[in-house]
Amino acid sequence: ELCDDDPPEIPHATFKAMAYKEGTMLNCECKRGFRRIKSGSLYMLCTGNSSHSSWDNQCQCTSSATRNTTKQVTPQPEEQKERKTTEMQSPMQPVDQASLPGHCREPPPWENEATERIYHFVVGQMVYYQCVQGYRALHRGPAESVCKMTHGKTRWTQPQLICTGEMETSQFPGEEKPQASPEGRPESETSCLVTTTDFQIQTEMAATMETSIFTTEYQ
């Protein structure tokens, strides 16, 4: 159920996951000069049920005389059961924070973490694209990508977004609200058997997410 590849890159655009599906793993990586504490977690795991999801495990880094070069690997399912559960929540979370069922929020920063976070996404994960400053969006469909299972293989749908250098007249160039339209299927399906359950559920949740989050916070 893990997605094999990274989401596609779009010229002059950036993407972000607004929430992470249960089953998503985040490697516990430390920046140069630091390493994971001994017996520390290799990864964080988004777990839970439809009403509440949270990140199991905690990433912790400690000073190191030499750079930690241990290669992170995707943990096996049996490893996942043995990990100690520690819910990570940011202090002072606003009461109006919306949550998407079956998803975890971005984990709060941990001390001396690596610059880049390495996520292992699962099927049904959605990421949203926006043009970077100085570029404006030409939409031909949803500016999002979904990890789908097709013919037994995972793939990311192609976001229907083109970012042009022509300056936009609005206040913030290149700013677009993430699109989550249930009817806007980025690519046509073939006649083979396709596992669409996760995608359909995710799309419905994305529509809910747009209503509950974007329309109230992205104004």
């Epitope: 890159e9 920063p109 400053q133």
Partner: nanobody
């Protein structure tokens, strides 16, 4: 876990200046946008300004452009907000916040408009008397 600690709030007369500081010990700055929100009594929390910890690009909401200046010291893990020509409308609790950058280390202003940041400070009160 990283904590955000604000300082520098206080009482100032209209037209005066204040400098807010946010200390983020242990934060890997170049993975985040770091900056400020504010919440006046009875109003929604609004994004004021941020700085991209990787490329140094900045954002200011319209009402503070030309009056506020955000800066960061990545070595000291601090972000400052220099507030000049303060107005009564600027009175609020100011919160330091951080949000993960998008792919390629980029960040867009619409993300900062969300109150749903990755981490919040407890806030510092700014009072502007007329």
């Amino acid at each position: 876990q990283v904590q955000l600690v604000e300082s520098g709030g206080g009482l100032v007369q209209a037209g005066g200046s204040l400098r807010l500081s946010c200390a983020a010990s242990g934060l890997t700055f170049d993975g985040y946008a770091i900056g400020w929100f504010r919440q006046a009594s009875g109003k929604e929390r609004e994004g004021v300004s941020y700085i991209n910890g990787r490329d140094g690009s900045t954002f200011y909401t319209d009402s503070v452009k030309g009056r506020f200046i955000i800066s960061s010291d990545n070595a000291k893990n601090t972000v400052d907000l220099q507030m000049n020509s303060l107005k009564p409308d600027d009175a609020a609790v100011y919160y330091c916040a951080v949000d993960r950058l998008g792919s390629r280390g980029a960040y867009v202003s619409s993300w900062w408009r969300s109150p749903d940041m990755d981490l919040w400070g407890k806030g510092t009160l700014v009072t502007v008397s007329s």
